[in-house]
Interface confidence: low
């Protein structure tokens, strides 16, 4: 056997080059037919009226012919035939790749309240062969699980993928992602979760600055809640106990005037959106107001005190989150 | 030819700066991410951090804040601060993401010791 | 953070199968690799994206993964697969995106 071809794999529309090589050459007939056994070159000469088939080398020692807009009813056994005695035939099989026509994402939710399940899935529709569906949440590679539809020699596959939402998620892009061997460097389509979460909530004492409450002064907090949608209630409560009357309440914050005793307690900053609610606790403890010393008439004495305060913060959440206590030595 | 080669480990007291630098040959690094994985003395592998073809980078909670990745044409360097004792290991630069299909080439490695 | 757990040593007779296994609730979702590492060299990947061998792995190295169990079989074991042998995955949520090693099992073949 002296009569060589490769096989051929070609991307649908693009241009398919068949090569039918002899070895040893005695100048006998080189032939190629098509996989209906048509005769597309005798020679140099093209019987078969398709002019996509063009010559492009014709010697003793090699046919080689190219078909330009290849299409998937191109692919089979092409066959090169040399006419020695006895003939020879070998063939060359063209495949044709077939790239997705189409890529997309399908979200179940447009919007997803965290520790939710939700369903993704990516269909590529039309392929060959069938492509291979990779899915990212943000840089991380997930596991989707695949089904593929065949419909006369073509691939459409969907992918779908289960993902358990948190709140970090939110804004992160979910990413199907196509490999195909018709598809040079990256294909995807990608969808942004949003997620909803029930608010944090955090109080700051904004006055007195250096935190200590003592008789007379006057007490500053403000409420931060933060969640999506951003919080819609933001309230102030006294635990156990009627607001004092001398407390104003302006959005945020809440503001008690001339401190004393009987204000001593625990003050909570509750918030609530759609998705739940939560609360952070602040426990006020008013101290005496400084003591101060009449001067001596005749003999001086210093005295020095020293007071420690303790403030608590004590941050909770009725969904069932860990509770944070801050301390704070002055 | 493509191969890693990881230079720059020493011996340094706590709390030195040390700089480590991965010269890569025969790697695209506009096309190849590039990992640091570490390992202590008769312990397991340990994932540091990754720098993309984009520059961007990720590392091990533990690493964020200490140790940065950063990259030219042919260099990776791993920038490690406050260095304390527990950070003595073996550092491998490797092509790729971890378990990447182009995480295949890892450079032998260079120790740091840190020791008073 | 997650941890991925391997039992810390297996053995297996000269040319007979042993199977590694590596566990951790994210496996169901995020994919394993496997390194093989020998004395005083460094990690090679065996296996990534559960199942896939790079060119140069001999097949008797194969990948599968069964819900929260990543495993790693070797067939026909030789005297030059006693290494140590580490599971790795990725997993993370929002920026905090990580890649975990398992502690690693020290495979000893005997016979």
């Known amino acids: 056997q002296n009569l060589f071809t490769k096989d051929v794999t070609v991307i649908e529309g693009e241009v398919a080059t068949i090569s039918c090589q002899v070895n040893k050459s005695d100048d006998s007939v080189i032939q190629l037919l098509n996989p209906n056994r048509q005769t597309i070159y005798f020679r140099d000469f093209r019987p078969l009226k398709d002019s996509r088939f063009q010559l492009l080398n014709f010697s003793s020692s090699e046919l080689k012919v190219s078909l330009t807009n290849v299409s998937i009813s191109d692919e089979g056994r092409y066959f090169c035939q040399l006419y020695t005695d006895p003939p020879q035939e070998s063939y060359t099989t063209i495949t044709v790749l077939v790239p997705p026509r189409n890529l997309m994402i399908d979200i179940q939710k447009d919007t997803a309240v965290e520790g939710e399940e939700i369903e993704v899935n990516c269909t590529a529709m039309a392929s060959k062969p069938a492509t291979t569906i990779r899915w990212f949440k943000g840089n991380t590679e997930l596991k989707g699980k695949s089904e593929v539809e065949e419909w006369s020699d073509m691939y459409t596959v969907t992918s779908q993928l289960m993902l358990k939402v948190h709140k970090e998620d939110d804004g992160v892009p979910v990413i199907c992602q196509v490999e195909h061997p018709a598809v040079t460097g990256n294909l995807q389509t990608q969808r942004y979760l949003e997620v909803q979460y029930k608010p944090q909530v955090h109080i700051q004492m904004t006055y007195p600055l250096q935190g200590l409450t003592r008789e007379g002064d006057a007490l500053e907090l403000t409420c931060e809640a933060i969640g999506k949608p951003q919080p819609v209630m933001v309230t102030w409560v006294r635990v156990d106990d009627e607001m004092p009357q001398h407390a104003v309440l302006s959005g945020p914050n809440l503001f008690i005037n001339n401190l004393n005793k009987t204000d001593n307690g625990t003050y909570r900053c509750e918030a609530s959106n759609i998705v739940g609610k939560a609360h952070s606790d602040y426990m006020l403890y008013v101290y005496d107001p400084p003591t101060t010393i009449p001067p001596p008439t005749t003999t001086t004495t210093t005295t020095t005190t020293t007071t420690t305060t303790i403030l608590t913060i004590i941050t909770d959440s009725r969904a069932g989150e860990e509770g944070s206590i801050r301390a704070v030595d002055h | 030819q493509k191969q890693l080669v990881e230079s720059g480990g020493r011996l340094v007291t706590p709390g030195t700066p040390l700089t480590l630098t991965c010269t890569v040959t025969?790697?695209?690094?506009?096309?190849?991410?590039m990992s640091w994985v570490r390992q202590a003395p008769g312990k397991g592998l340990e994932w540091i951090g990754v720098?993309?073809?984009?520059?961007s980078t990720w590392y091990a909670s533990w690493a964020r804040g200490r140790f940065t990745i950063s990259k030219t044409s042919t260099t990776v360097d791993l920038k490690m601060t406050s260095l304390t004792t527990e950070d003595t290991a073996t550092h491998f630069c490797?092509?790729?993401?971890?378990?990447?299909?182009?995480?295949?080439?890892w450079g032998p490695g260079t120790l740091v010791t840190v020791s008073s | 953070s997650f941890v991925l757990t391997q039992p810390a040593s297996v053995q297996v007779d000269l040319g007979q199968t042993v199977s590694l296994t590596c566990t951790a609730e994210?496996?169901?979702?995020?994919?394993a690799s496997w390194y093989q590492q020998k004395p005083g060299q460094a990690p090679v990947l065996l296996i990534y994206?559960?199942?896939s061998r790079p060119s140069g792995v001999p097949d008797r190295f194969s990948g599968s993964s069964s819900g929260n169990t990543a495993t790693l079989t070797i067939s026909g074991a030789q005297a030059g697969d006693e290494a140590d042998y580490y599971c790795?995955?990725?997993?993370?949520?929002?920026?905090?995106?990580?890649?975990?090693f398992g502690g690693g099992t020290q495979l000893t073949v005997t016979g």
């Open positions: 490797a092509r790729g993401d971890v378990g990447g299909a182009d995480n295949n080439i």
């Open positions: 025969g790697i695209d690094l506009s096309s190849h991410g």
């Open positions: 720098i993309y073809p984009s520059g």
């Open positions: 994210t496996l169901s979702r995020s994919y």
């Open positions: 994206r559960d199942t």
């Open positions: 790795a995955t990725s997993d993370g949520s929002g920026s905090s995106y990580q890649y975990v």
